[in-house]
Interface confidence: medium
Amino acid sequence: FERTRSLQDPCSNCPAGTFCDNNRNQICSPCPPNSFSSAGGQRTCDICRQCKGVFRTRKECSSTSNAECDCTPGFHCLGAGCSMCEQDCKQGQELTKKGCKDCCFGTFNDQKRGICRPWTNCSLDGKSVLVNGTKERDVVCGPSPADLSPGASSVTPPAPAREPGHSPQ
């Protein structure tokens, strides 16, 4: 399809950053202000993303690439390409429809985003609680009483739980 198009279509020669201007005998005109074309052969340029309100500009729009936004302090990105900004909470809290709420007893959140997660159940691994959990920190599991013999291994904290619903930034 692309080869056929280039044979028939003079616009296929217009590079990224331009559009093929039908009103000027199909010459390649630069994209208008605040617009871009990331592909060649376009008859129009795309509107640049505007980082307004809670969004701030991380990368300015150029004639060949869109602007990139991140969030103002106190907020963090969600979604592909930072499509949303969500309010930060303190460690030991989670964001609900009514705002930031403290983690319930038996749960913790060691980040400014995401949800409160249950403390690790040390007994499931046959271990005992060495350090109690808080709203901000998980419990630290220690060796079981049976392991407290000479040569027993040292304390092993639980593996950090992956936060659900968020890929690493």
């Epitope: 279509d9 093929c20 201007d21 009103n23 208008p32 605040n34 990331s38 052969g41 376009q42 129009t44």
Partner: antibody, heavy 118, light 111 residues
């Protein structure tokens, strides 16, 4: 001859969704952006948003961000708009319009009438 | 959002006379020397039709009696001489800033 052929009228219940189409012919579909515009009976025009069929890049009027979803199928040269959670406020004629280089709508579809009624 | 205010809301003009429709923007729609202002004509039961783009450029196949002028925040559409076929609604539209917006429309009739 450049044409945008829109799908037929839709009658829908409140809360339902509708998906309308806009089939392009007479030009290379992927090289022009496709915009959508709403017109309520006897009222003005409202810009909903647009899609670039090549990159599938979309921009929405914030007012319609949770109402409209724009998609495009390059293989059939067709743009689509889905409207969700319909209310009587969504009863209107919806136009697709091709965007010319200096950001003007040079070709319009005939419109799809959506009627929301219980 | 940029608000476009058209005046008058309705207008009756004699055949052969001049019709002038104004469109005022709440902020400038100019950028780097380009005015992102367009004018459309709409007849009952039909989609809008492009008349003028970038404030003063005629759309393809548009008769020479339609002309546009203005920059910044103040724009006008002139129709001279008025013909019977010109009875319609006329809308201005800006494409400088998202969301793109339209004026409320002017109804033009024969006097």
């Amino acid at each position: 001859q450049v044409q945008l052929q829109q799908s037929g009228a839709e009658l829908a219940r409140p809360g339902a969704s509708v998906k309308m189409s806009c089939k392009a012919s007479g030009y290379i579909f992927t090289t022009y952006a496709m915009h959508w515009v709403k017109q309520r009976p006897g009222q003005g025009l409202e810009w909903i948003g647009y899609i670039n069929p090549t990159t599938v890049y979309t921009i929405y009027n914030q007012k319609f961000k949770d109402k409209a979803t724009l998609t495009a199928d390059k293989s059939s040269s067709t743009a689509y708009m889905q409207l969700s959670s319909l209310t009587s406020e969504d009863s209107a004629v919806y136009y697709c319009a091709r965007l010319g280089g200096h950001w003007y709508f040079d070709v319009w579809g005939a419109g799809t009438t959506v009627t929301v009624s219980s | 959002d940029i608000v476009l205010t058209q005046s008058p809301a309705s207008l009756a003009v004699s055949l052969g006379q001049r019709a002038t429709i104004s469109c005022r923007a709440s902020e400038s729609v100019d950028n780097y020397g380009i005015s992102f202002m367009n004018w459309f004509q709409q007849k009952p039961g039909q989609p809008p039709k492009l008349l003028i783009y970038s404030a003063s450029n005629q759309g393809s196949g548009v008769p020479a009696r339609f002309s546009g002028s203005g920059s910044g925040t103040d724009f006008s559409l002139n129709i001279h001489p008025m013909e019977e076929d010109d009875t319609a609604m006329y809308f201005c539209q800006q494409s400088k800033e998202v969301p793109w917006t339209f004026g409320g429309g002017t109804k033009l009739e024969i006097k």
